[in-house]
Structures are given as C-alpha cells and as structure tokens.
C-alpha cells in the first residue's frame, strides 16, 4: 500500500514538475527590466528564451521573436537545449511511469517489469529536473554577470550633458517557476526510485521438497533464491545517482539585450 502511494505521489509530483518546466520554457519573463534605478519608466521590457517583449503603460504589449539561430548567444542556446532535453526526458518518463503504476494492470505484466519501469522513469525524472535546474541556473548566472557589468557603465553620456540610462535586467518569474518545477521533478524522480525498491519481488524461499531416490534417503533443500532483477536487498551493486553538482568557474558574458531580430 505504502509503495503504491509513494509511486503515485512520485508520479503526480513529477507531472506537476514537468508541467512547470514546460510553462517556464514557454514563458516570456525569464528576465525583466530592473526598475530600481528607473521606477518612473512608462515602458517595461522583459525577455524569454524565444522572444523579447515590451509592455507600454498604455496597455499595449509588443513581442518580437528571435528569428535567428546563429545570431543568438551560445549561452541562450545552451539554456534552450537544457530545457528542451528536460521536457523530452520528462515526457518519456511520464509515459513510462504510467505503465509502471501499480494501480494500473496491463496484461500479465510482472512486478519485476514494473519495478524496472519505475526505476527508469525515476531516473528520467531526476535527469529532467537537473536539466531544468541547470538551465535556469545558467540563465540566472548570465543575468547576474550582466547586471553588474551594466551597473559598472550604467550612465554613458555625451560630455556629461545627455544621459542614456542602460536597461538592466533582473530575475523574471520564469526563473522561479523553473527552479520550483525542476525541484519537484527531481523529488518525484527520487520518490519513483524509492517506490521501485518496494515493487521488486522479495526473496522467495521455496519449501523443502524430498526426493526419494531408490536406495538412498537424501533430502534436497535448495538455498534461498534471490530474484535476479538486481533490486533485492543486495547492497553490493547498489548505485548512488549523484546529481553532479557543478561549479561555474568561468564568468559568462552575456549581452543585456539579446533580441537579435
């Protein structure tokens, strides 16, 4: 019962997480104009992975897609790739986990097969969540680097007479959605992996059977047979799936305006 609950909950949490990753990827507010130094602006800029938008006080919003591939910064492309990989892996994971659910009966599928599928989907969810978290974090790192770069030369002027305020960008709502969604997918994946252990068939101790050979009275007792799924209580082959925390050694430079239209 606890296994079914853990598996079901893991599925639901992952489903919410993947929906969040998709939402974050599609959102336009990955970076939003920082209003700290210019709170009186009548024009508000925000940017996503696919287009940049401008919202006027008048209520009109104009969005322009990045209709180029080669002209875009490599880091933006990397973030796009990470998010898409996360979505694809998550979607496959969801598909696999549907068939792995203990509460769903598909033909005469054995528990060992369901356990395998549960583990597979769990790993997929973990990698999907890590991809999303990595993508969002790379973008956030670009924003932070850029923010301080643009702060350093905030005001550029012609002889100090005319001031041009450089637009600075800060974290948009999509980043927070992405972080939370990635975390949920990761948690869901871990729950699926935990559930998988409970789904694996336990040790099957076959009862002793007496074989009466002519002239001999020998009782044959086979030893405890372990299911060869690899998910028993055997700790020798236990794998620890490390999230692989990476440190950003290189400072990424990223243009404050990446709407190459």
């Amino acid at each position: 019962m606890a296994v079914t609950a853990c598996q079901g909950l893991g599925f639901v949490v992952s489903l919410i997480g993947i929906a969040g990753i998709i939402a974050a990827t599609c959102m336009d507010q990955w970076s939003t104009q920082d209003l700290y130094n210019n709170p009186v602006t009548a024009v508000f800029n925000y940017q996503g992975l696919w287009r940049s938008c401008v919202r006027e006080s008048s209520g009109f919003t104009e969005c322009r897609g990045y209709f180029t591939l080669l002209g875009l910064p490599a880091m933006l492309q990397a973030v796009r790739a990470l998010m898409i990989v996360g979505i694809v892996l998550g979607a496959i994971g969801l598909l696999v986990s549907i068939f792995a659910l203990k509460c769903i009966r598909i033909g005469s599928m054995e528990d060992s097969a369901k356990a395998n599928m549960t583990l597979t989907s769990g790993i997929m969810f973990i990698v999907s969540g890590l991809c999303a978290i990595a993508g969002v974090s790379v973008f956030a790192n670009m924003l932070v680097t850029n923010f301080w770069m643009s702060t350093a030369n905030m005001y550029t002027g012609m002889g100090g007479m005319v001031q041009t305020v450089q637009t600075r960008y800060t974290f948009g709502a999509a980043l927070f959605v992405g972080w939370v969604a990635g975390g949920l997918t990761l948690i869901g994946g871990v729950m699926m992996c935990i559930a998988c252990r409970g789904l694996a068939p336990e040790e099957t101790n076959y009862k002793a059977v007496s074989y009466h050979a002519s002239g001999h009275s020998v009782a044959y007792k086979p030893g405890g047979f372990k299911a060869s799924t690899g998910f028993g209580s055997n700790t020798k082959n236990k794998k620890i799936y490390d999230g692989g925390a990476r440190t950003e050694d290189e400072v990424q430079s990223y243009p404050s305006k990446h709407d190459y239209v």
Epitope: V40, C53, E56, S256
Partner: antibody, heavy 118, light 113 residues
Framework: QIQLAQSGPELKKPGETVKVSCKAS????????MNWVKQAPGKGLKWMGW????????RYAEEFKGRIAFSLETSASTAYLLINNLKNEDTATYFC???????????WGQGTLVTVSA | DIVMTQSPSSLTVTVGEKVTMSCKSS????????????LTWYQQKPGQPPKLLIY???TRESGVPDRFTGSGSGTAFTLTVSSVQAEDLAVYYC?????????FGAGTKLEMK
C-alpha cells in the same frame, strides 16, 4: 467612433473644489488608461498624470501631487479629475486623453475651461 | 524629469514651403527592448484639443497626411512638413512618452507670412 466628452466650463472661487468629468464611448473603457493634461491660457501643455482604469491606480506628476485626485465610475465609463483648494493659477483648460500606441494620446476630450476668480 | 526643448519657438512660412522643426530631449528616448523611440508629435489649432500626428518618433497616425514626417533617434528629433498648407498653421508639440512625467516641449508655432 471613439469619443471623450468632457463636462462644461466651471467658474470657481479660490479655495473651492472642482470636479471635471470625462465620459468615454466607442471602446472598452477598462482597456485603456486615461491621462489628464492642463493648458493655461496662451501656454503649452502640461501632463498632470494618468489613471489605470483596470486597477484604478493613479499616477500624478510631482507638481500636481497633493491637490489633485483622479477617480473613476467604471459602470458609467467616466473618469474624473478633482482639484482641491483652487488657486488663480489653476485657471486653465483641462483635457482628458486616452492612451494609444507608443504611450501617445490619439483621443482627446474637447477640454473643460476652469476659471478661478475671486 | 526629461526636459524637452523645441526650436524654433515660431516659424513664418509660405504655402508650399518645406518646414523643419526640432525637438531635443535631455535623456535618450530610445528603448533598447524594441529599438523604438518614445517620442510623439502633436498639432494644436486655436480652441481645439491637440491632434496626434506622429508616435514612436516616425510612425504616422492613421488619417494624417503624408506630408508630415517624423525622424530622429535617441535625443534629437525632427518633424518635417514637406509642403505647408494653410490648414497646417498651428502649434506643434513634441512629447516624451518614455519616462514619467510625460513631459511636453514648449511648442513651435507655425505662422503665415
């Protein structure tokens, strides 16, 4: 067609209060912000501020803060400008103007002349 | 506040003449997000409310004759009337639509010789 109809001229004494109305028609009132512009006789245009019809949130120009207030009657598609403690220098024509593309004002009321005289 | 400076303050012209008036802002009105300049031109005739001519510095409002042309970027802008007609005699105002308060220039008065 889009129209902004303002209330008639007002003659007020110093210290009094005046309320100018601006009734909108021909468009969805809630979709566009309403601006107020002052023009003293023979002078240029001065932006007083605007009100977000959707949220009811006003923004006033610094020099007008404290003595003016914008309000709405959404059901009647009407915006109001209230000027308290009138002074002689408040004698002017007050225009309401609806927002458009580029934060421009494509639609204007005909103007309301407010005369402040003892 | 962004200060809008218009020049000249008045212009005396003859019908059919080409006229150019200038508007300068104390800060750039160019928005990096969409590469648009948030500057608007209005025409005001005596006893009438202002009429929108140009927005985004160069986009002509529908119904405005094509003899009116807006140009410029950043802090320097120009309104050109290619061939002045009698009905064009009015005061022309430029306006900052980029940053609050939305300031107007003092105006350029177009007069007949």
């Amino acid at each position: 067609q889009i129209q902004l109809a303002q209330s008639g001229p007002e003659l007020k004494k110093p210290g009094e209060t005046v309320k100018v109305s601006c009734k909108a028609s021909g468009y969805t009132f809630k979709n566009y912000g309403m601006n107020w512009v002052k023009q003293a006789p023979g002078k240029g245009l001065k932006w007083m501020g605007w009100i977000n019809i959707n949220t009811g949130e006003p923004r006033y120009a610094e020099e007008f803060k404290g003595r003016i207030a914008f309000s709405l009657e959404t059901s009647a598609s009407t915006a109001y400008l209230l000027i308290n403690n009138l002074k002689n220098e408040d004698t002017a024509t007050y225009f309401c103007a609806r927002y458009g593309y580029g934060n421009s004002f494509p639609y204007w009321g005909q103007g309301t002349l407010v005369t402040v005289s003892a | 506040d962004i200060v809008m400076t218009q020049s000249p303050s008045s212009l005396t012209v003859t019908v059919g003449e080409k006229v150019t008036m200038s508007c300068k802002s104390s800060q750039s009105l160019l928005n990096s997000g969409n590469q648009r300049n948030y500057l608007t031109w209005y025409q005001q005739k005596p006893g009438q409310p202002p009429k929108l001519l140009i927005y985004w510095a160069s986009t002509r409002e529908s119904g405005v004759p094509d003899r009116f042309t807006g140009s410029g970027s950043g802090t320097a802008f120009t309104l050109t009337v290619s061939s002045v007609q009698a009905e064009d005699l009015a005061v022309y105002y430029c306006q900052n639509d980029y940053s609050y308060p939305l300031t107007f220039g003092a105006g350029t008065k177009l007069e007949m010789k």
